[in-house]
Interface confidence: low
């Protein structure tokens, strides 16, 4: 786990703001282990928050919190909720794996101890906002955010290298004739041969290609490529992506509140990389071709990293 820079100062003062402050107990002081007579953010306001702008979307997989002392008083936040945003405008409440009510985190029990709360699943956000719900005397906080850079996770997951086995690649259907079988396992980037891509039995937008990673992976992008067969160029121009944790319930990839239509290939040989923002934490991934030239034909790679790399 990597500290994102509250304690080190890598997160600068201007990135830390709050709904208000008590006296000199400013947001910029809300840094884990900060020392001095005034050494934390504090506020008397009941409906308060403190916000950190990470300047770019990051994976945040935990928060360490600490209170502070003022003379003989212990000041700390005992319970809080977390909200997060990619743009600073549209905020979501962190709910963990639940689709129900918000998640209330248990914070500190004294002024000096450090409580580490883990976000499972991790939060992908540029902005993170902590709202105290219960506190001792005043909401008072020193903290560190734990996480990593989104861009540190764009390794090929194994379509081309065959680290992803044939059995892990399936499809709604595949085209076969007496000359060739265009099976799902042929959907590997740069694959060569007589039948060197996946092609469905029929060309329609209901067809899909599926990869089962066999465990939860963080998927940050996909690379797609078409194919040339008997002088005919075939490639997918547009596609959708869906994901699932159980292989039964599928969720289409949304961006800015809309189903994202990915722009694919423009010829049969040039690989095109599409990044997923925010990344997907998923076991299963499906590509749904929506428009194509001549025939649906797909070779691909998935980019990302293992989800446990995040913890």
């Amino acid at each position: 786990q990597t500290p994102l820079g509250m304690a080190s100062g890598h997160i600068r003062d201007f990135q830390i703001t709050a709904s208000g402050q008590y006296g000199q107990w400013a947001p910029k002081l809300a840094r884990l282990h900060y020392s001095g007579s005034i050494n934390a953010w504090s506020t008397k306001e009941p409906f308060s928050w403190i916000k950190v702008d990470l300047l770019a979307p990051m994976i945040i997989h935990g928060i360490k919190t600490q209170g502070a002392r003022q003379k003989f008083s212990s000041l700390y936040i005992s319970q809080f909720i977390i909200m997060y945003s990619l743009d600073g405008k549209k905020w979501q409440t962190y709910r963990g794996n639940s689709t129900g009510t918000l998640m209330v985190f248990f914070g500190n029990v004294d002024s000096s101890g450090i409580k580490h709360n883990i976000f499972n699943p991790p939060i992908i956000a540029r902005y993170i906002r902590l709202h105290p719900t219960h506190y001792s005397i005043r909401s008072t906080l020193r903290m560190e955010l734990m996480g990593c850079d989104l861009n540190s996770c764009s390794m090929p997951l194994g379509m081309e290298s065959k680290a992803i086995s044939d059995a892990q690649i399936t499809a709604s259907s595949y085209f076969t004739n007496m000359f060739a079988t265009w099976s799902p396992s042929k959907a590997r980037l740069h694959l060569q041969g007589r039948s060197n891509a996946w092609r469905p039995q029929v060309n329609n937008p209901k067809e899909w290609l599926q990869v089962d990673f066999q465990k939860t992976m963080k998927v940050t992008g996909v690379t797609t490529q078409g194919v040339k067969s008997l002088l005919t160029s075939m490639y997918v121009k547009e596609f959708l992506i869906s994901s699932s944790q159980d292989g039964h319930q599928w969720t289409l990839f949304f961006q800015n509140g809309k189903v994202k239509v990915f722009q694919g290939n423009q010829d049969s040989f040039t690989p095109v990389v599409n990044s997923l923002d925010p990344p997907l934490l998923t076991r299963y991934l499906r590509i749904h071709p929506q428009s194509w030239v001549h025939q649906i034909a797909l070779r691909m790679e998935v980019l990302g990293c293992e989800a446990q790399d995040l913890y």
Epitope: P46, F47, Q79, I81, M83, D87, K89, K90, W91, Q92, T93, T99, G100, T101, L102, V104, H131, T133, H134, G257, K258
Partner: antibody, heavy 121, light 106 residues
């Protein structure tokens, strides 16, 4: 799924106060965002204010800040709105509404049946 | 908080598509919700987070939100869709509603 049941209709004189209650059942009341929305006869919806029981503090629309008190009792899973210094333009149906998100960014997905408050001399 | 602007009324023939707009400066920066209210009933949530449908809401209801305008689209409008429709968004921690649009199915 949370259900919200409100108290009955009220008829009040101008200058007096009214309190309407809203009892929640079937969910986690404490972290559920409860708001009050009113609708004058033949008019649109107007947000009066809201409360998140775990915060214990209410958030009120600017127009009502001096006249409205919103409270919640976690033990009985009941939210209350009290409106003071009533005037005829406060005549409306008052809805207790809830959302699974503290700030109901997911929309108000649960609505009480409404309580008609009539202010008349 | 400034309110949200909706057309007072929209008319549509059965089976046609109705679009109800809701506008305010930079509304696309906020999440918009939509509600349907039939006479004598409490409003009901139709769309949240711009385009998501709660369970039980028919697929013919869809939403979008960008720029200064959120739009509720009802495709294949039915007589039962005749109702008042309200948009709603949050201005910091204050909820604001549109004035409402009466949808008439001719």
């Amino acid at each position: 799924q949370v259900q919200l049941v409100q108290s009955g209709a009220e008829v009040k004189k101008p200058g007096s106060s009214v309190m309407v209650s809203c009892k929640a059942s079937g969910g986690t009341f404490s972290s559920f965002g409860i708001s009050w929305v009113r609708q004058a006869p033949g008019q649109g919806l107007e947000w009066v204010g809201g409360i998140i029981p775990i915060f214990g503090t209410a958030n009120t629309a600017r127009n009502f800040q001096n006249r409205v008190t919103i409270t919640a009792d976690e033990f009985t899973s009941t939210a209350y709105i009290r409106l003071r210094s009533l005037r005829s333009e406060d005549t409306a149906v008052y809805y207790c509404v809830g959302g699974r998100d503290a700030y109901s960014f997911d929309g108000f997905d649960v609505w009480g049946q409404g309580t008609m408050v009539t202010v008349s001399s | 908080s400034s309110g949200l602007t909706q057309p007072h009324s929209v008319s549509v023939s059965p089976g046609q598509t109705a679009n109800i707009t809701c506008s305010r400066d930079k509304l696309g920066h906020k999440f918009a919700s939509w509600y349907q209210q039939k006479p004598g009933q409490s409003p009901a949530l139709l769309i949240y987070q711009d385009s998501k449908r709660p369970s039980g809401i028919p697929e013919r209801f869809s939403g979008s939100n960008s720029g200064n305008t959120a739009t509720l689209t009802i495709s294949g409008t039915q007589a039962m869709d005749e109702a008042d429709y309200y948009c709603q968004a949050w201005d910091n921690t204050t909820a604001v509603f549109g004035g409402g649009t009466k949808l008439t199915v001719l």
